[in-house]
């Protein structure tokens, strides 16, 4: 049998300074530019070596990020949300999603990572 | 992190054709834009191919134009080059990189052509 893959969910408040070079993060979403298929969210694309994310260690490539200094990122065009993240000041707090891939036993099998039942 | 390995090279004659594969693993494959490099003996690395992370947009060195084709297959996590009609001095190692794609939210800026976070081992092509 096959094993399954099951995704643990975490959310997580990181507060980053912008750095000389800024934030040193890309995303990719957007409703004009759906990453995931009926998902208009905002995805962490790349993190730049030395940047203030990479320095920070916390923010992950495949993160989805839910909001920057509170309002929410849902809805929005990708260079609006572009926008948000340039004109967000010297301290910004991000409200990000974590997807973890977790690696289940066989199909039939509940694993540790099953969050079911 | 990103892992890539290359797969496909050999010894062909002027004239052949082959194709090779980079298998990604370790994080979601669509968000990477994708690149082809290659490195001869004694020489430096130079740029091969890219292809954007939506697939949308290729881009290829002078000297490979009409000959090479790079394309990429999500469903798989993979990226494939695919060259004809090769030509002695097409002999190098082939290297596969990737990047992130999007925007940057800092600033609009050209990423360096070799501006990539991951790359693999390669893979050797020889044409004799």
């Known amino acids: 049998m096959n094993g399954r893959v099951d995704y643990l969910v975490t959310e997580e408040e990181i507060n980053l300074t912008r750095g000389p070079s800024g934030l040193g993060f890309n995303i990719v979403g957007g409703t004009d530019q759906q990453y995931v298929s009926n998902d208009s969210g905002i995805y962490v694309s790349r993190i730049k070596e030395n940047g203030a994310a990479a320095l920070d260690g916390r923010l992950q490539e495949g993160d989805k990020i839910l909001s920057v200094n509170g309002q929410d990122l849902k809805n929005l065009l990708h260079q609006d949300a572009v926008d948000l993240f340039r004109n967000a000041g010297y301290a910004v707090s991000l409200r990000v999603q974590h997807r973890l891939q977790v690696q289940n036993g066989p199909i039939g099998h509940r694993g540790e990572g099953d969050p079911s039942g | 992190d990103v892992q890539l390995v290359e797969s496909g090279g050999g010894l062909v004659q002027a004239g052949d054709s082959l194709r090779l594969s980079c298998a990604a693993s370790g994080r979601p494959f669509n968000m990477y834009d994708m690149g082809w490099f290659r490195q001869a003996l004694g020489k430096e690395r130079e740029f091969v191919a890219t292809?954007?992370?939506?697939?949308?947009?290729?881009n290829y060195a002078d000297s490979v134009k009409g000959r090479f084709t790079i394309s990429r297959d999500n469903a798989k996590n993979t990226v494939y080059l695919e060259m004809n009609s090769l030509k002695p001095e097409d002999t190098a190692v082939y290297y596969c990189?990737?990047?992130?794609?999007?925007?940057?939210?800092?600033?609009?800026?050209?990423?360096?052509?070799?501006?990539?976070?991951?790359w693999g081992q390669g893979t050797q092509v020889t044409v004799s």
């Open positions: 292809v954007s992370w939506t697939g949308s947009s290729t």
């Open positions: 990189a990737a990047r992130g794609g999007g925007t940057s939210v800092d600033s609009d800026y050209d990423v360096g052509e070799f501006e990539y976070d991951y």
